[in-house]
Interface confidence: low
């Protein structure tokens, strides 16, 4: 029903936040974090974060790995503290991005996502626990 | 990460209508729910209401039809109206962003209603 | 959903171990936060979901309990601790903290 809404939403993570985009903050909210590492003129620059809008990091988290970046992403709090994204070396085959750190996660089943055809609504993912 | 900046009228008289605005920085506008909250001098925090980016709101019942809560997303931006001021309104108002819980705050507006 | 607090303010020594309670009215399934709030400022979220903390939040502060009875406890209470601390629930609407307590420093 289109007012029964409380409990805030249970599908936003806490994410730890590392970086320029970090401002002063060491944590954020969003629907998936992330650990990240680019070549920038030669230095390793490593960000971890948040994608506060599922679609966002969906398409940001499938990019395969280049020698130049790579990208893991994780669903759960804190899920991306210990998670340190790797460059693929030659010759060896480099893991899908959503290795998800089982351990770590509480992963939004396939239902919850409305599978991959459906385009997830944010406001889906805003209700509030209702009796 | 997601600042809030907040702004309106600190002084009114009595049956006028308050009015304050909340600017979002550094967020998603879809991510969070928009709240107000409120802090008469020397006591507690009571939740007005809540409005999200498409504009759904959940108000408190307590404050019945006195409170609308609005959004304008282009400018992410959201707004209270409180109607029918008394000097029990009298209080600091904060804009909050939150999911699970209240994580920012606006750096609030002392509201006095006097006549 | 009406949240109970206790006390309303206290008053101990730095180094000690201070316990605040918070009840609440009915079974709020564990949706509950902690806020800190220092004169002067916005309040600040120290605790979601009845024990986690935020990063950043010194391991002194932890939460505990379940169901409706719930408690927050610095475990050695230091002079930036003082402030006013509130428990909130989010099981249902409206959201509703408790009334807060009061934290002091005996001298």
């Known amino acids: 029903m289109e007012d029964e809404k409380p409990k805030v939403n249970p599908k936003l993570y806490m994410c730890v936040c590392e970086g320029l985009s970090c401002g002063n903050e060491d944590h954020c909210e969003g629907q998936q974090c992330f650990s990240s590492l680019s070549i920038n003129d030669g230095f390793h620059v490593y960000q971890k974060g948040c994608f506060q809008v599922y679609e966002q990091g969906k398409m940001t988290c499938k990019t395969p790995p280049s020698p130049g970046q790579a990208v893991e992403c994780c669903q759960g709090d804190w899920c991306n503290r210990n998670i340190t994204a790797q460059l693929p070396t030659k010759g060896k085959s480099f893991p899908g991005t959503q290795n998800f750190h089982l351990e770590e996660q509480k992963l939004i089943s396939e239902e919850d996502l409305g599978g991959e055809q459906k385009l997830i609504s944010e406001e889906d993912l805003h209700h509030h626990h209702h009796h | 990460q997601v600042q809030l900046q907040q702004w309106g009228a600190g002084l009114l008289k009595p049956s006028e209508t308050l009015s304050l605005t909340c600017a979002v920085y550094?967020?998603?506008?879809?991510?969070?729910?928009w709240s107000w909250i409120r802090q008469p001098p020397g006591k507690g925090l009571e939740w007005l209401g809540e409005?999200?980016?498409?504009?759904?709101?959940n108000n408190n019942p307590s404050l019945a039809s006195r409170v609308t809560i609005s959004v304008d997303t282009s400018k992410s931006q959201f707004s209270l109206r409180l109607t029918s001021v008394t000097a029990a309104d009298t209080a600091t108002y904060y804009c909050?962003?939150?999911?699970?819980?209240?994580?920012?705050w606006g750096q609030g507006t002392r509201v006095t209603v006097s006549s | 959903i009406q949240m109970t607090q206790s006390p309303s303010s206290l008053s101990a020594s730095v180094g000690d171990r201070v316990t605040i309670t918070c009840q609440a009215s009915?079974?709020?399934?564990?949706?509950l936060n902690w806020y800190q709030q220092k004169p002067g400022q916005a309040p600040n979220l120290l605790i979601y979901?009845?024990?986690n903390l935020l990063p950043g939040v010194p391991s002194r502060f932890s939460g505990s309990g379940s169901g409706t009875d719930f408690s927050f406890t610095i475990s050695s209470l230091q002079p930036e601790d003082i402030a006013t601390y509130y428990c909130?629930?989010?099981?249902?609407?409206?959201?509703?903290f408790g009334g807060g307590t009061t934290v002091a420093i005996r001298r």
């Open positions: 979901d009845v024990f």
């Open positions: 009915q079974d709020i399934n564990n949706y």
């Open positions: 909130q629930h989010y099981d249902d609407l409206p959201l509703t």
């Open positions: 409005i999200n980016h498409r504009g759904r709101t």
């Open positions: 550094n967020g998603s506008f879809s991510s969070f729910y």
């Open positions: 909050t962003a939150h999911t699970r819980g209240f994580l920012y």
